[in-house]
């Protein structure tokens, strides 16, 4: 007869690992008990098991709880046992010795491979803002055993560097992406995968990208000079920018303080019925975390009386 | 060689404890279970309970349950088992013994320790 | 009262053969190994057969051991005045979650 076995045994961590054993023996041979011990290079041979033909199993200390037979129905010929909730130190080398009858004893060894599931984790770099050279957007770590595989999906274009810390049975890997930051990128994600032997599927995990950035400020309002004129109503002058965070807005006057019945609403100055009170250099003033911007406008009120047209100088300043 | 060395005579007044020690050696003292055996003067042997070595964790015969407490010093190959509320009749030699056969993992004693002779007497 | 029923006393001369019963139920020898341990006067216990009729190294096989349903017997063969000693069987009783004896057989060699 022979003993049949595997080479390598696999199991994700946690899970139970089936040891196999069977003796194909010829007609009229049985098994008197199966012996199991962990055999390590360098160690001593640790016993798990004992598989007796008549009394069943007997556990050694050290695996109590821990190891069974296979659930019915078995065979009598079959030494096999289970490993319950597989922990990465149940790595290794395993040996089955089997004692027939009348064929004497038998042994094989397999490798048990216990897999760990990464838990990866994403961390973010320090904030992004618009004129930064190459920046870290975001690092991924992810450990487990074997090594994992970690990169990026993004639409997003920059580089990556990988490195690789090995412990004594896992390994940990790092991935970082790195990109110069602009305006286009804000809100486009940047997800990490990482793949793993232990892994159903990839494990994904996104980070939404937020760049800092604030454009020129202008003023809308003044493009037809002729509709400023003694009287109008409804007349309104609007800050226009746009930024990441999103920036607030001010209003001031250059040459005074604003005219009473002016309104600030948020971008927008919003005007009573004009009078020649309300000539004047406006500075609308636009800020955020990152920076701030300025554009003045002046105004100049048409008197319909007068003949003399209307000139608006309109200046823009940073 | 492989051997189990208990503890000297002991002496007890009723209602005392007392506490015998067994020290292994010659084997790895967290891969076999240590069991403990009485045999009162002109009787039998009687099983008292069972510890493991490595998780500590213990049974006992019903008749000893609430008065035996059996621990275990792994950094001394050394196993406890301690007697409550003693009576008379618990007057014994007490013996601690290893399981198992030729280092397979076998239902049976191969090592016994030398015994402690336990005296409970006002 | 022990839990296993063995014979107090045997008796046999030199030389010759001599048998020691040992009797159970279903949930210790029926189900389980027996064992059989020799005590010399004043000594502690020795492992003589196990596993119902194996030998640990160094025992004679002059011993031996057999098991039929719930009863055990122990034969010693050849008998010297060195065998005289007292003879206890074991098993695990699954009831008893626990090791039990009997009480004991006291063998005279004649």
């Known amino acids: 007869g022979e003993l049949e076995t595997s080479d390598v045994v696999t199991v994700v961590l946690g899970q139970d690992a089936k040891l196999p054993c069977f003796y194909r023996g010829d007609s009229g041979e049985q098994v008197g008990q199966v012996a199991w011990a962990r055999v390590d290079a360098g160690e001593g041979a640790q016993e798990l098991a004992l598989l007796h033909s008549k009394y069943g199993l007997h556990v050694s200390p050290a695996y109590e709880g821990r190891v069974e037979q296979p659930p019915p129905p078995r065979n009598p010929l079959d030494g096999s046992v289970l490993l319950r909730n597989a922990v990465q130190a149940d790595e290794g080398e395993y040996e089955c010795r089997v004692s027939t009858f009348p064929a004497g004893s038998f042994q094989a060894r397999l490798r048990l491979r216990v897999l760990v599931p990464p838990l990866p984790s994403l961390n973010p770099g320090p904030a992004l803002e618009e004129g930064q050279g190459l920046t870290l957007a975001a690092s991924c770590t992810a450990e487990g055993s074997p090594a994992p595989s970690v990169t990026w999906d993004t639409e997003v274009k920059g580089t990556t560097s990988s490195r690789s810390f090995k412990h004594s049975r896992s390994a940990a890997v790092t991935s970082e992406f790195h990109l110069v930051p602009s305006r286009s990128m804000n809100g486009q994600p940047l997800t990490c995968v990482v793949s793993h032997p232990g892994l159903l599927q990839d494990q994904r995990i996104t980070h939404i990208l937020h760049v800092s950035f604030l454009a020129e400020a202008s003023v809308r309002g003044l493009e037809d000079q002729n509709l400023w004129h003694i009287g109008r109503e409804g007349a309104m002058l609007k800050c226009l920018s746009e930024g990441q965070p999103p920036p607030s807005y001010n209003w001031t006057r250059l040459d005074g303080p604003l005219p009473s019945g002016v309104r600030v609403d948020g971008d927008t100055l919003g005007f009573p019925p004009l009078t020649t009170e309300h000539s004047g250099i406006y500075v609308c003033h636009v800020s955020n975390e990152f920076s701030s911007r300025d554009s003045q406008v002046t105004v100049d009120v048409l008197d319909p009386q007068e003949d003399s047209g209307k000139q608006v100088d309109l200046v823009s300043a940073s | 060689q492989v051997q189990l060395v208990q503890s000297g005579a002991e002496v007890k007044k009723p209602g005392a404890s007392v506490k015998v020690s067994c020290k292994a050696s010659g084997y790895t003292f967290t891969s076999y279970y240590i069991h403990w055996v009485r045999q009162a003067p002109g009787q039998g042997l009687e099983w008292m309970g069972i510890?493991?070595?490595?998780?500590?964790?213990?049974s006992s015969a019903q008749k000893f349950q609430g008065r035996v407490t059996m621990t275990r010093d792994t950094s001394t190959s050394t196993v406890y088992m301690e007697l409550s509320s003693l009576r008379s009749e618990d007057t014994a030699v007490y013996y601690c013994a290893k399981e198992g056969v030729g280092g397979e993992l076998l239902r049976a004693f191969d090592i016994w320790g030398q015994g402690t002779l336990v005296t409970v007497s006002s | 009262q022990s839990v296993l029923t063995q014979p107090p006393s045997v008796s046999e001369a030199p030389r010759q053969r001599v048998t020691i019963s040992c009797s159970g139920s279903?949930?210790?020898?029926?189900?389980?190994?027996v064992n059989w341990y020799q005590q010399l006067p004043g000594k502690a216990p020795k492992l003589l057969i196990y596993?119902?009729?194996l030998l640990p190294s160094g025992v004679s096989d002059r011993f031996s051991g057999s098991k039929s349903g719930t009863s055990a017997s122990l034969a010693i063969s050849g008998l010297q005045s060195e065998d005289e000693a007292d003879y206890y069987c074991a098993a695990w009783d699954d009831s008893l979650n626990g090791f039990v004896f009997g009480g004991g057989t006291k063998l005279t060699v004649l």
């Open positions: 596993y119902d009729d």
């Open positions: 510890i493991n070595p490595i998780s500590g964790r213990t």
């Open positions: 279903s949930s210790n020898i029926g189900n389980n190994a």
